[in-house]
Amino acid sequence: AFGISGVQKYTRALHDSSITGISPITEYLASLSTYNDQSITFALEDESYEIYVEDLKKDEKKDKVLLSYYESQHPSNESGDGVDGKMLMVTLSPTKDFWLHANNKEHSVELHKCEKPLPDQAFFVLHNMHSNCVSFECKTDPGVFIGVKDNHLALIKVDSSENLCTENILFKLSET
């Protein structure tokens, strides 16, 4: 696994990323695991980065990702009691200059090196399904979420609100 030292070199509260020329309002480091407590890890293979979902050994250190939170500049279309808040989108970066990307054509989640401003494929709408779980919905493809398939991350279509609690799109964030 890689990325721990790389991320810690840029744990500044704010750094220059943008959706529409704006900076993230908040950033922090966290490890990412599945609903079933498998860890999301990142490895360099053949000059490209691979993402794995795996059980770690007892004392093995978890990879961290830098979560950057952005306020949507568009007003929410949803009715209800939350419309006065701005929708939050996140980017996830396990090491400097690399971000998780949604590849909608291949239904895959990939790590891409890219320059700022980041493309829309790097942004995910954040959902809270359970008290300690989050889900990541593709900004570029509403209804499609980051999920777990065959020990890899993949894009999974969620057809109805009942399926938002499907375990394979639920993730835990941990700072330890």
Epitope: Y28, Y69, E71, D81, G82, D84, M87, M129, L173, E175
Partner: nanobody, 121 residues
């Protein structure tokens, strides 16, 4: 709707201390993080400190070692203990929370009205 109410601002001498509080209320399902931003006269808003639901924290370089952020999950309240205050800490301090409500799973960003902190002799 989620409301954030800040308190604890005021006038303090350089080297002094203040404790800010921010209470979140409304139909809150979950809170992902709560934090403090500040805006000095004529400047943009900047992050001061954030604490996540898991207890992780992040601080602006300018306040590390002087400010401490904490939260009480049972009350959906966040605190900012500010020590060794300097004139350059003078600003309006805003509470910010990322939360979802019972009407939607989408996490949204909510802001308080702000509380003024003035550091002056």
């Amino acid at each position: 709707q989620v409301q954030l109410v800040e308190s604890g601002g005021g006038l303090v001498q350089p080297g002094g201390s203040l404790r800010l509080s921010c209470a979140a209320s409304g139909s809150i399902r979950t809170v992902n993080y709560m934090g403090w931003h500040r805006q000095a006269p004529g400047k943009g808003r900047e992050l001061v400190a954030v604490v996540t639901s898991g207890g992780g924290t992040n601080y602006a370089d300018s306040v590390k070692g002087r400010f401490t952020i904490s939260r009480d999950d049972t009350k959906n309240t966040v605190y900012l203990q500010m020590n060794s205050l300097r004139a350059e800490d003078t600003a309006v301090y805003y509470c910010n929370a990322a939360a979802s409500t019972y009407s939607s799973t989408v996490v949204r960003s909510f802001w308080g009205q702000g509380t003024l902190v003035t550091v002056s002799s």
